[in-house]
C-alpha cells in the first residue's frame, strides 16, 4: 500500500501559529479569527524508520504544494528548509533521511526531532514572526513543544 | 480485563452543553490513542473526537468542530468529551474507543452512553 | 470525504453457510480498511484490520479480502452468534468514515 498522509496543523506551545514567510520559509506568530486561515496546513507523511509507542517517524509536506521540510548541512550546522521535489515520486514510505522527522509525544509534548540530526529539533523563537528552525537544545529559551490538529482532507 | 466505562450521558436542550467521561482500566491508559465514536438511532457509526496519547494530537471531523473538546487526564485513567451547543443531530449512542489516528481501527468499545438533544 | 458503501444491506443465511459482504469505496483506499461487528444492544467489536489480518480472539471463520476498491468480508461457516450488524470503516484519509451497516439474519 502507499504511504498514507493526513492533514494537520501545529502550534507551537505558546500557542503561536506557522505561517509562510516568502517561498521557502516558515514563520511563528500569534494568530486570531479569520487570521488563522493563514496558517500552513501539512500534510503528514507516515513513512519507514524506527517506530515505538512514543516515536513515529514522520514527513512533513506542505498541503498540495511539492514542498518538504528537509534537514541539511548549511555551513557546518544543521539547518531546517523548505525543499522543492519531484511531486510525481513524493510522497512515498521509503523518504531519504533529510525530510524524516521522529515525532515524539511525551506527556502532553510533542516534538519533532531530526532522524537526520538526533538531538536536533524543529523550533520556534520566543518571540514573534521568527523563522521556524532547526535547534539543538531543548528545555532553553527556544521552544521545541508542540501541539497538532489533524484536518479533514 | 481490558475495559471502558462511559457515563455522563442524558437528555439535554439544543444549545446547551454536556460532559461525557470514560474511565478505562485493564490497559495502560496513557499508552494509547483515544476516540469518541457515536451512534444516531438506528443508524450507523460516525467517529467524532480523537485525542493523541499524550493528549498533545486532536481531531475532530466538521459536523462537530468548534463544538466539542476532547481531553484526557492519563493520571486518573479518564477521557472525557465537552459537548457545547448541542443540536437534536447529536442525539445518540456515544462511544468511547481506544484507537484513532495512527493505527486508524478501534479495538476496545465501552458500553455506551445515550445522548438526547430535544426540548 | 471518502464514502463507504455497503451491499447488501441486509441478508438472510442458514447456519453453515458461506456469507459474503461487500464494502466499496468512493476512492481508492490501498488496503486501509477494518470489519467490525456490532451484536444487538452491544458495543461494535473490532474483527478484521488492514484488510484482512484479524484481531486478537476472532475465529478463523472470518476473513477479509480486497480487489481494486471493493472489499469484501466472509463468514466461511456462519454460526448463530454470528447474528449482527457489520460494519467497515476506512483510514486512508480524514475523516475516516464507517459503511452504512450489513444487517445479517438468520433463516
Known amino acids: 500500500a502507499p504511504v498514507r498522509s493526513l492533514n494537520c496543523t501545529l502550534r507551537d506551545s505558546q500557542q503561536k501559529s506557522l505561517v509562510m514567510s516568502g517561498p521557502y520559509e516558515l514563520k511563528a506568530l500569534h494568530l486570531q479569527g479569520q487570521d488563522m486561515e493563514q496558517q500552513v496546513v501539512f500534510s503528514m507523511s507516515f513513512v519507514q524508520g524506527e517506530e515505538s509507542n512514543d516515536k513515529i517517524p514522520v514527513a512533513l509536506g506542505l498541503k498540495e504544494k511539492n514542498l518538504y521540510l528537509s534537514c541539511v548541512l548549511k555551513d557546518d550546522k544543521p539547518t531546517l528548509q523548505l525543499e522543492s521535489v519531484d511531486p510525481k515520486n513524493y510522497p512515498k514510505k521509503k523518504m531519504e533521511k533529510r525530510f524524516v522527522f521522529n515525532k515524539i509525544e511525551i506527556n502532553n509534548k510533542l516534538e519533532f526531532e531530526s532522524a537526520q540530526f538526533p538531538n536536533w529539533y524543529i523550533s520556534t523563537s520566543q518571540a514573534e514572526n521568527m523563522p521556524v528552525f532547526l535547534g539543538g537544545t531543548k528545555g532553553g529559551q527556544d521552544i521545541t513543544d508542540f501541539t497538532m490538529q489533524f484536518v479533514s482532507s | 480485563e481490558v475495559q471502558l466505562v462511559e457515563s455522563g450521558g442524558g437528555v439535554v436542550q439544543p444549545g446547551r452543553s454536556l460532559r461525557l467521561s470514560c474511565s478505562s482500566s485493564?490497559?495502560?491508559?496513557?499508552?494509547?490513542?483515544m476516540s469518541w465514536v457515536r451512534q444516531a438511532p438506528g443508524k450507523g457509526l460516525e467517529w467524532v473526537a480523537y485525542i493523541s496519547h499524550g493528549g498533545a494530537g486532536t481531531y475532530y471531523p466538521d459536523t462537530v468542530k468548534g463544538r466539542f473538546t476532547i481531553s484526557r487526564d492519563n493520571s486518573k485513567n479518564t477521557l472525557f468529551l465537552q459537548m457545547d451547543s448541542l443540536r437534536p443531530e447529536d442525539t445518540g449512542v456515544y462511544y468511547c474507543?481506544?484507537?484513532?489516528?495512527?493505527?486508524?481501527?478501534?479495538?476496545?468499545w465501552g458500553q455506551g452512553t445515550p445522548v438526547t438533544v430535544s426540548s | 470525504d471518502i464514502q463507504m458503501t455497503q451491499s447488501p444491506s441486509s441478508l438472510s443465511a442458514s447456519v453453515g453457510d458461506r456469507v459474503t459482504i461487500t464494502c466499496r469505496a468512493s476512492g481508492n483506499i490501498y488496503t486501509y480498511l477494518n470489519w467490525y461487528q456490532q451484536t444487538p444492544g452491544k458495543a461494535p467489536k473490532l474483527l478484521i484490520y488492514?484488510?484482512?489480518t484479524l484481531a486478537d480472539g476472532v475465529p478463523s471463520r472470518f476473513s477479509g479480502s480486497s480487489s481494486g476498491t471493493d472489499y469484501t468480508f466472509t463468514i466461511s461457516s456462519l454460526q448463530p452468534e454470528d447474528i449482527a450488524t457489520y460494519y467497515c470503516?476506512?483510514?486512508?484519509?480524514?475523516?475516516?468514515?464507517f459503511g452504512q451497516g450489513t444487517k445479517l439474519q438468520i433463516t
Open positions: 470503516q476506512h483510514f486512508w484519509r480524514l475523516p475516516y468514515t
Open positions: 485493564g490497559f495502560i491508559f496513557s499508552r494509547y490513542d
Open positions: 488492514d484488510a484482512k
Open positions: 474507543a481506544r484507537g484513532g489516528v495512527y493505527k486508524g481501527y478501534f479495538d476496545v
